[in-house]
Interface confidence: low
């Protein structure tokens, strides 16, 4: 391409007309503000093309820049384009004018930007200002472009001098826009609502500052559309926040809502979705097996605990033997019932240092307008064994008898042993059972009573026997599911004249 | 559909006051929206002047309100106010009201959805 005068910037005359001629090997063209003013197109003999722009009667208006260009640029290179500015020194304009957006500068982050304010005359100096300020701005201007460099977020002036008058341009405001990569997330009040319940799901975004909010959800498919509204999160900068609200709702409203977001700067986008379900009536639900018979230890703490799943939120009652439970004041007993998930709860019956009393029937209750379930189960509370009583006598018959006392709960189990060699019992050699067998050397005696005020059963053993010809070391030892305690007594032959 | 009209304008001296209200219908509830005076002198842009987000009361202002005007709405009644103090003949314009349901737009300065008809103010001197 060739440009004729090749510029490449040029200072004409107000009310002069001048011509300016572009040529090139395929059809070429004048461009002026994105448009093709009026111009003469011709192809000389030679196959060269030719454009010819005469500007006439030029104004202050007419400063600005010129391209030639390929007509058509199909398959040509795209450097082929020549720019040309023109300067026309016009008193009468102060500034060149602008369109509206070029007044207001938007930024995604900190980088060199311009303010596009012009003047016909190449010779004027021109200042940039803050809006209320008169001192002038250490920023480099370009006669063709305007001041270049990194502003805040600020409205500007440019100020020149024409003559005797000082002359302000529009002012341009510059905006720093908040964009991140956009993070959504989404919760909803409740997950789970009756029929006829309101429906409410937030959808949050952090750290940008112009999004657009979509939502989908089963209702929007059969085309009944529900209109969200989207806020600032108080004293949260850049936190927005699209509310989608649906009023009494329905059974078919039970599905997947997802809210996709997109931000219009960086077209990035994100989603998220979440499950709504919509129940006829409210429910209670026990999850797992709790056995009808439960235990706890004397002077331990127990928890006895229920898991259930209900909607809406329900009450929850403790019973023993159908009294009403509440916490004690003195600390025995601590009741809790504990929202674990949206609709799972945990409740919790806690009896501390457990005494026999606390024995009974104990029965949970849940429940609230819709549905109820209970639970219960007998508490017994487990007594280690203890050996009261181990104690010898010689009846006139000649044999002699050994008597062993014990308590607990669950009922004791009794084990009597005996070792001959005193010496070596009970390390190195072991006990030997007795009572077991139908030999006539021993007999066995046992009873066992419940006793019902202290809850626990009492067992006495008598062992009877028949030849004890020399020391004997015999062992009583009583057990149960929570312990063992274990007596010995030696017993002597009749003849010996010591016992211990 | 947004409706918004505007009232309240009128013929002042420099230096004294107007209220202009713009009633909003169309929905139940202007929340989440943007809402926001314009202002167009004759021959001129229609220029930015303040802006106000329905349900937090988020407001902005260009500088040549700022100090001298003030937005505010009344979501009972579904109204926007510009109380406009200290008034100069160069405030004299058609005031336009606007709205948007994005309430992140207050501080574009452009690009709302709804626009009232305007109502006319002049400031003698």
């Known amino acids: 391409l060739v440009v004729t005068p090749p510029g490449p910037e040029l200072v004409l005359n107000v009310s002069s007309t001048f011509v300016l001629t572009c040529s090139g090997s395929a059809p070429v063209v004048w461009e002026r503000m994105s448009q093709e003013p009026p111009q003469e197109m011709a192809k000389a003999q030679d196959g060269t093309f030719s454009s010819v722009l005469t500007l006439t009667n030029l104004t202050g208006l007419d400063t600005g820049e010129y391209f030639c260009t390929h007509n058509d640029s199909r398959g040509l290179e795209t450097d082929e384009r020549k720019r040309l500015y023109i300067f026309v020194p016009d008193p009468t304009v102060g500034f060149l004018p602008n369109d509206a957006e070029e007044l207001f500068i938007f930024l995604t982050e900190i980088t060199e930007i311009t303010i596009p304010c012009r003047v016909t005359d190449p010779q004027l100096v021109v200042t940039l200002h803050e809006k209320k300020g008169d001192v002038a701005l250490p920023v480099p201007y370009d006669h063709q472009r305007g001041f270049s460099g990194i502003f805040e977020d600020r409205s500007y002036i440019c100020k020149t001098t024409i003559g005797d008058r000082e002359v302000d341009s529009d002012a341009y405001y510059v905006y720093r826009l908040q964009v991140s990569s956009i993070n959504v997330s989404v919760n909803a009040v409740q997950t789970v609502v009756r029929q006829g319940e309101n429906i409410t799901l937030m959808c949050i975004v952090i750290g940008n500052e112009v999004v657009n909010f979509e939502w989908t959800y089963p209702r929007k498919e059969s085309g009944r559309l529900v209109e969200p509204v989207t806020d600032f999160l108080l004293d949260m900068p850049y936190h927005i926040r699209s509310i989608l609200h649906i009023p009494s709702a329905e059974l078919e409203d039970s599905g997947t809502y997802t809210c996709n977001v997109t931000e219009s700067v960086n077209d990035h986008q994100d989603e998220k979705a979440i499950n709504i379900t919509v129940v006829e009536s409210g429910y209670v639900r026990l999850l797992g097996e709790v056995g009808t018979l439960q235990f706890a230890e004397l002077h331990r703490s127990r928890t006895l605990q229920v898991v259930f799943e209900a909607y809406p939120p329900p009450t929850v009652l403790w019973f023993k033997d159908n009294r009403t439970l509440g916490d004690s004041s003195a600390g025995e007993i601590a009741l809790s019932t504990r929202n674990v998930s949206e609709t799972r709860y945990v409740s919790e019956l806690t009896l501390v240092r457990v005494k026999v009393a606390e024995a009974g029937h104990y029965t949970m209750r849940a429940f609230h307008e819709d549905a109820e379930v209970q639970l219960s189960f007998q508490l017994q509370i487990n007594v280690p064994v203890r050996v009261l009583e181990l104690s010898e006598s010689h009846p006139d018959s000649g044999e002699q008898t050994v008597r062993c006392r014990g308590r607990g709960m669950p009922q004791p189990n009794i084990i009597w042993s005996a070792c001959r060699d005193l010496k070596r019992c009970p390390r190195e050699l072991p006990p030997t059972l007795l009572g077991n067998s139908s030999e006539e050397e021993s007999q066995l005696e046992t009873n066992v009573t419940y006793w019902e005020e202290e809850q626990e059963f009492e067992v006495v053993s008598t062992l009877r026997l028949q030849h004890v010809d020399r020391p004997l070391s015999v062992r009583c030892t009583l057990r149960n599911a929570v312990g063992q305690d274990t007596q010995e007594v030696i017993v002597v032959p009749h003849s010996l004249p010591f016992k211990v | 559909e947004v409706q918004l009209v505007e009232s309240g304008g009128g013929l002042v001296q420099a230096g004294g006051s107007l209220r202009l209200s713009c009633a909003a219908s169309?929905?139940?509830?202007?929340?989440?929206?943007?809402m926001a005076w314009f202002r167009q002198a004759p021959g001129k842009e229609r220029d930015f002047v303040a802006s106000?987000?329905?349900?937090?009361?988020?407001?902005y202002y260009t500088d040549s309100a700022q100090g001298r005007f003030t937005i505010s709405r009344d979501s009972a009644k579904n109204t926007v106010y510009l109380e406009m103090n200290s008034l100069k003949p160069e405030d004299t314009a058609v005031y336009y009201c606007?709205?948007?349901?994005?309430?992140?737009?207050?501080?574009?300065?452009?690009?709302?959805?709804?626009w009232g008809q305007g109502t006319q103010v002049t400031v003698s001197s």
């Open positions: 606007a709205a948007d349901p994005k309430a992140s737009r207050f501080r574009i300065l452009r690009e709302y959805a709804y």
């Open positions: 169309g929905r139940t509830s202007f929340s989440g929206y943007a």
């Open positions: 106000i987000t329905w349900s937090y009361g988020y407001t």
